[in-house]
C-alpha cells in the first residue's frame, strides 16, 4: 500500500507525459490524478515507466473503479494489462473486438497467460458464442486457442465459424474434441465438390466416422498417411483393405512404416492376410486363411 | 538479424558539438525504446536517456538536460544522438541500446559503440 | 539516484572455478535487476533479467538471485569465454544506473 502524501509544489502532473518517470513511487500516488491518468490511459504505453511505475498507476486506476474499468480504460491499458490479475479481468465486460485485439496484441508472441485466458472468456461469454470474427482474431493470436477449449465449449461453434480455421489450428485437438468439431466443418464446407471438399475436410477428420471414409474412398482423394494416423482407430477398423487402398491412393505404400502404430496395426488384426497380400506391401499378422471372424460387436447390439 | 549498428568514430574539439547515429535493422521501432548509455575510457556504464522512435519523445537523465537531444528518422529506422559543448569529460565510446516497451529499462540488444574523443 | 556497488571490482579465478559477484543496491529495487557481460572493445551482453531469469541464449552456468537491496551472479563452471567484466544494472527507477564492474581475469 502507498502511503498518502502531499504532493510536492509544482509537482503536479497536468498531463501523463514523459517527466513522469523520474518521479518517485509516492511522487506519482500524490501528484498525478486518477481521473487525469483514465483519460489520457493511451498515453501511458508510450512511455517508458518501470515495473514499480506501472504498480502504482494500476493502484490509481483501482481506487477509481473499485467495480472494474470502463471498457473506454481497458481498451487503451497497453502494456499495463500485463499487471492485471485474473481476478481483476473477472470485473470487466468487454464487449468490443476492438478492445479485445488491443489487448491480446499486448501479448503477442507469448503464451497464453492466465490473464488473456480469462479476458478471452469474458468476452466470449459475453457474446454468447464463438463467433467468426472472434475466431479469426483468436486463432490469428493463438493457433492453438480451438484445441484449449472442451468439447462442451465447442459445441457453442456456430459452423460458419469453421471457415476461420487452419489446419495448424487443430494441431493439437484430441479426438473428442475433432468429435464435435467434424460434424459442424462437414455442414460448413457440404456445398464444396469433391477435391475442394477433401481440402478443407482433412484436418478435421480425427472425428470422421467409418460411413464418411467409405464414402470419401470412393472419390479419389489420396488421403497422405499422416491424416490417416489420426483417424479414430474404431472408424477405420470396419474399412475393407479395397476402401483403404481406394483411401489412400499412391500412399498405400505408407502402410507398411506404420504397421506397427495404431490404427494401422489394430486394422491389419481384423483383415483377412489374404486380402493383405493382395497390397504386395508384405504387412503381416491378418486372419489366417480358413478362420472364421464372428462379428460379436453386431451380436451384442442385437442382445 | 536483429541489429543496432552505430556511425564511425568521431574527434572533436572542446565546445563543439557531435552527432552519433544508430541504425535499427531486423526489428521495427515500433514496441520498442532506445537508450544512449556512455562509456569513458577504463569507466563503467552511465545512461544518458531513452528515446521513443515512434513518437521521438524523450526523457534525459539530469546532467544531460540542455546539452544533448535524441532524435528519430522512422522512414530509415535510425536515431540520432546530439551532443553539445563537448569537454574532455565527454571522450567516451557512446551505446545505444534496446528495450521492449513492456520492460523499458532492460537493453537486450547493444550497438557496436561509436568512440568519440574531445582533444583541442 | 539509487546507487549500485559492485563486489569484488576484480577477481582472478581459473577455469572450471564456482564464482559468484555481489551487487547491493542503495534502496529496496525489488526484483528489478539486470546482469550484463562486456569482453574488451565489445558491447555489453544482457545476461540476467529481473534478477534471476536467463536471457535466451545464454549457458544455463549463469544463474542470478536476490531480491530487494542485494543480488548475486552465479558462474558454476568457469569457461574460458568467460572472463570478462560483469555489470548489475537497477531498473527500478529512473535514472537507470550500473555498478562500477567486476573484471573477471585468469589465474
Known amino acids: 500500500e502507498v502511503e498518502k502524501t502531499a504532493c510536492p509544489s509544482g509537482k503536479k502532473a497536468r498531463e501523463i507525459d514523459e517527466s513522469l518517470i523520474f518521479y518517485k513511487k509516492w511522487e506519482l500516488e500524490a501528484c498525478v490524478d486518477a481521473a487525469l491518468l483514465a483519460t489520457q490511459m493511451d498515453r501511458v504505453n508510450a512511455i517508458p515507466f518501470t515495473y514499480e511505475q506501472l504498480d502504482v498507476l494500476k493502484h490509481k486506476l483501482d481506487e477509481l473503479y473499485p467495480q472494474g474499468y470502463p471498457e473506454s480504460v481497458i481498451q487503451h491499458l497497453g502494456y499495463l494489462f500485463l499487471k492485471m490479475s485474473p481476478e481483476d479481468i473477472r470485473k470487466w465486460n468487454v464487449t468490443s473486438l476492438e478492445t479485445l485485439k488491443a489487448l491480446l496484441e499486448v501479448n503477442k508472441g507469448h503464451e497464453m497467460s492466465p490473464q488473456v485466458a480469462t479476458l478471452i472468456d469474458r468476452f466470449v461469454k459475453g457474446r454468447g458464442q464463438l463467433d467468426k470474427d472472434t475466431l479469426d482474431t483468436l486463432t490469428a493470436f493463438y493457433p492453438g486457442y480451438l484445441c484449449s477449449l472442451s468439447p462442451e465449449e465447442l459445441s457453442s461453434v456456430p459452423p460458419s465459424s469453421i471457415w476461420a480455421v487452419r489446419p495448424q489450428d487443430l494441431d493439437t485437438c484430441d479426438p473428442r474434441q475433432l468429435d464435435v468439431l467434424y460434424p459442424k466443418a462437414r455442414l460448413a464446407f457440404q456445398n464444396m465438390n469433391g477435391s475442394e471438399y477433401f481440402v478443407k475436410i482433412q484436418s478435421f477428420l480425427g472425428g470422421a466416422p467409418t460411413e464418411d471414409l467409405k464414402a470419401l474412398s470412393q472419390q479419389n482423394v489420396s488421403m497422405d498417411l499422416a491424416t490417416f494416423m489420426k483417424l479414430r482407430t474404431d472408424a477405420v477398423l470396419p474399412l475393407t483393405v479395397a476402401e483403404v487402398q481406394k483411401l489412400l491412393g499412391p500412399h498405400v505404400e505408407g502402410l507398411k512404416a506404420e504397421e506397427r502404430h495404431r490404427p494401422v496395426r489394430d486394422w491389419i488384426l481384423r483383415q483377412r492376410q489374404d486380402d493383405l497380400d493382395t497390397l504386395g506391401l508384405g504387412l503381416q499378422g491378418g486372419i489366417p486363411n480358413g478362420y472364421l471372424v464372428l462379428d460379436l460387436s453386431m451380436q451384442e447390439a442385437l442382445s | 538479424q536483429v541489429q543496432l549498428v552505430q556511425s564511425g568514430a568521431e574527434v572533436k574539439k572542446p565546445g563543439a558539438s557531435v552527432k552519433v547515429s544508430c541504425k535499427a535493422s531486423?526489428?521495427?521501432?515500433?514496441?520498442?525504446?532506445l537508450h544512449w548509455v556512455r562509456q569513458a575510457p577504463g569507466q563503467g556504464l552511465e545512461w544518458m536517456g531513452i528515446?521513443?522512435?515512434?513518437?521521438?519523445?524523450?526523457s534525459m537523465a539530469q546532467k544531460f538536460q540542455g546539452r544533448v537531444s535524441m532524435t528519430t528518422d522512422t522512414s530509415t529506422g535510425t536515431v540520432y544522438l546530439d551532443l553539445g559543448r563537448l569537454g574532455s569529460d565527454d571522450t567516451a565510446v557512446y551505446y545505444c541500446?534496446?528495450?521492449?516497451?513492456?520492460?523499458?529499462?532492460?537493453?537486450?540488444?547493444w550497438g557496436n559503440g561509436t568512440t568519440v574523443t574531445v582533444s583541442s | 539516484d539509487i546507487r549500485m556497488t559492485q563486489s569484488p571490482s576484480s577477481l582472478s579465478a581459473s577455469v572450471g572455478d564456482r564464482v559468484t559477484v555481489t551487487c547491493q543496491a542503495s534502496?529496496?529495487?525489488?526484483?528489478?535487476l539486470n546482469w550484463y557481460q562486456q569482453k574488451p572493445g565489445k558491447a555489453p551482453q544482457l545476461l540476467i533479467y529481473?534478477?534471476?531469469d536467463l536471457e535466451t541464449g545464454v549457458p544455463s552456468r549463469f544463474s542470478g538471485r536476490g531480491s530487494g537491496r542485494d543480488f548475486t551472479l552465479t558462474i558454476s563452471s568457469l569457461q574460458p569465454e568467460d572472463f570478462a567484466t560483469y555489470y548489475c544494472?537497477?531498473?527500478?527507477?529512473?535514472?537507470?544506473?550500473f555498478g562500477g564492474g567486476t573484471k573477471l581475469e585468469i589465474k
Open positions: 541500446a534496446r528495450a521492449d516497451n513492456w520492460n523499458a529499462g532492460s537493453m537486450d540488444v
Open positions: 531486423g526489428f521495427t521501432f515500433i514496441g520498442y525504446y
Open positions: 528515446i521513443n522512435p515512434s513518437g521521438g519523445r524523450t
Open positions: 534502496e529496496d529495487i525489488n526484483n528489478s
Open positions: 529481473d534478477a534471476s
Open positions: 544494472q537497477q531498473l527500478n527507477s529512473y535514472p537507470l544506473t
